[in-house]
């Protein structure tokens, strides 16, 4: 058993049929010694008396808010949550496996630049009685500070018969050094509580591996005289790190016909313009990627040819 | 060339070669986090590689003030990786074909380090840890770790030379 926060405790249980469970001793936070009784949740049934209460925690029915009273007055509370371990593996019932980039990916994180700011998100099908708490650091043995906000519900989607909820959190490294080569990864830890179930999820990454620039901005076409060619131009996204002579991007320009089956013409360039042939009913799209490190491409910025 | 006394390197040549190094490093190990081996082996194996850290003056302001600190750090790293890529870690099994990007990477690391340091002048170089894994799986794990680390190192070096070519070239 360990303390998650004041008056909230997590009991770690090996979860299998007829498991013996864990013996837990609760102590009432009071100077009083006599006349103390204990109850669980809203029940008025007295579970025991005395300053301490010893219970055998085996299942969710044994978890909940234990309260000690004296003469009708509440003295203190202890909320017990359960953390299940099945076949040596901690349960992951609350969050959905996003399976990208690999199986058992529950947390996904992205950064728009090298400033040390990043966003993480996760998915669940649970709609109520759900709380999240997020902590982060750079490195684990001698951790350096990363400050995370509160996790918020950022999107709701219908997937078949189920509703899916996306939560996200923004974090910022306290003393970021955008130009340095990271040697210690960022660690992100999410505590999830659904009713009386506790689970924790972690992710470890370098900012450079989660970089995904915003799409290029101000995408424009300029027809070239007496030609089917056009000059496409664009600018670095506002959110990208500066100076651009140091934090450079590379770009992919694509000409795509109306039909998905039509052949795509692609050009790669380090410049912020390119000359392409604009076919009727086609569209021109441009996306960006860090020039020197192959992290994710941005989403496409697009304009129609006509 | 970054000769002693603080004269400038051939920024544009360094820029071109460092960008080529980035491409080669990603050709040699294009995939991220796909290894079944990643949980195995000793984490200490690549902890000794030289990193370009915050105080090394490789940020735009540091380069403007005095690029020598940063160039020396980059040179140290290039020599370190060049030695690793020429070692048994990369020559033993699993076999690399003669068209492997590792061979070109090795040559380009040497080429860039020579651009930064002419004959007759020696910056201090970091000691290479004596890593001599006997098993193919240990060797492969080390290769992947070294190449991932090299990708990060050459990305910073390429940014330095791109910025230098754009803002510090005579």
């Amino acid at each position: 058993i360990w303390e998650l926060k004041k008056d909230v405790y997590v009991v770690e249980l090996d979860w299998y049929p007829d498991a013996p469970g864990e013996m837990v001793v609760l102590t009432c936070d009071t100077p009083e010694e006599d006349g103390i009784t204990w109850t669980l949740d809203q029940s008025s049934e007295v579970l025991g008396s005395g300053k301490t209460l010893t219970i055998q925690v085996k299942e969710f029915g044994d978890a909940g808010q234990y309260t000690c009273h004296k003469g009708g007055e509440v003295l203190s509370h202890s909320l017990l949550l359960l953390h299940k371990k099945e076949d040596g593996i901690w349960s992951t019932d609350i969050l959905k496996d996003q399976k990208e980039p690999k199986n058992k990916t529950f947390l996904r994180c992205e950064a728009k630049n090298y400033s040390g700011r990043f966003t993480c998100w996760w998915l669940t099908t649970i709609s109520t009685d759900l709380t999240f708490s997020v902590k982060s650091s750079r490195g684990s043995s001698d951790p350096q500070g990363v400050t995370c906000g509160a996790a918020t519900l950022s999107a709701e989607r219908v997937r078949g018969d189920n509703k899916e909820y996306e939560y996200s959190v923004e974090c910022q490294e306290d003393s970021a050094c955008p130009a340095a080569e990271e040697s210690l990864p960022i660690e992100v830890m999410v505590d999830a509580v659904h009713k009386l179930k506790y689970e924790n999820y972690t992710s470890s990454f370098f900012i450079r591996d989660i970089i995904k620039p915003d799409p290029p901005k101000n995408l424009q076409l300029k027809p070239l005289k007496n030609s089917r060619q056009v000059e496409v131009s664009w600018e670095y996204p506002d959110t990208w790190s500066t100076p651009h002579s140091y934090f450079s991007l590379t770009f992919c320009v694509q000409v795509q016909g109306k039909s998905k089956r039509e052949k795509k013409d692609r050009v790669f360039t380090d410049k912020t313009s390119a000359t392409v042939i604009c076919r009727k009913n086609a569209s021109i799209s441009v996306r960006a990627q860090d020039r020197y490190y192959s992290s994710s491409w941005s989403e496409w910025a697009s304009v129609p040819c006509s | 060339r970054a000769v002693p006394g603080g004269s400038s390197p051939a920024w544009t040549q360094c820029q071109q070669l460092s960008q080529k190094l980035c491409t080669l490093a990603w050709s040699a190990h294009p995939l991220v986090g796909h290894m079944d081996l990643r949980e195995e082996g000793d984490e200490e194996t690549t902890n000794d590689v030289p990193h370009i850290q915050c105080g090394d003056g490789c940020d735009p302001q540091g380069l403007r003030d005095n690029s020598q600190f940063c160039l020396q750090r980059i040179h140290q790293g290039l020599i370190f990786y060049e030695k690793l890529l020429g070692s048994d870690i990369f020559t033993g099994e699993p076999s690399l074909l003669p068209d492997s990007p590792v061979g070109q990477l090795h040559a380009s690391l040497l080429g860039l380090s020579q651009l930064l340091q002419p004959e007759g002048h020696h910056w201090e170089t970091q000691q290479i840890p004596s890593l001599s894994p006997s098993q193919p799986w240990q060797r492969l794990l080390l290769r992947f770790k070294i190449l991932r680390s090299l990708q990060a190192f050459v990305a910073v070096a390429a940014r330095v030379f791109a910025h230098g070519a754009a803002t510090l070239s005579p």
Partner: antibody, heavy 120, light 107 residues
Amino acid sequence: QVQLVQSGAEVKKPGSSVKVSCKASGYTFTAQTMHWMRQAPGQGLEWIGYIYPRDGSTKYNENFKGKVTITADKSTSTAYMELSSLRSEDTAVYYCAIPDRSGYAWFIVWGQGTLVTVSS
Amino acid sequence: EIVMTQSPATLSVSPGERATLSCKASRDVAIAVAWYQQKPGQAPRLLLFWASTRHTGIPARFSGSGSRTEFTLTISSLQSEDFAVYYCHQYSSYPFTFGGGTKVEIK
């Protein structure tokens, strides 16, 4: 796209030689090693060897040394595999293939195969 | 040379079922193993490399695992087009070698 097109089927007498060609397109021929495999009827695959067209260097499976010669013509982006002193056991489908560009020998593109039949 | 031993030689499976193919190397090959699919009259087609990484365009029902000497190819739910011969291949040591193949046939 990358393609490897092999020469047609051959029927040869024991003791003679045969030269199978593999024409490459869609990539820089000199930049990658070209490998040869064989598959006897109803059997598994055997790696014969490779040539690196950039410098002409070759490496052979010991089991095929003296039996096989691999060459390449840079001007036509074509690799050749010559089998000498043919015996009935050399009856097989011969494949050319190129590996991934990371420098390890998993084979991403294969020729369609050339059946060589050795029969008197 | 490294001997790659595949088992079983033939696997009879119903469409929609799971198929598990085994490959054992006579010595440590790290994860330098590829898997190929071959249909009659066709050249082999690459499925996986580094023991578990799917080649471009290969469906997610194909997965691989293992390291050093023991490797597995799993086809989670067999489709009609998956009935073929499967070969494992080590590219750790010269001469590169292939397993004898496992024929996956319709039950």
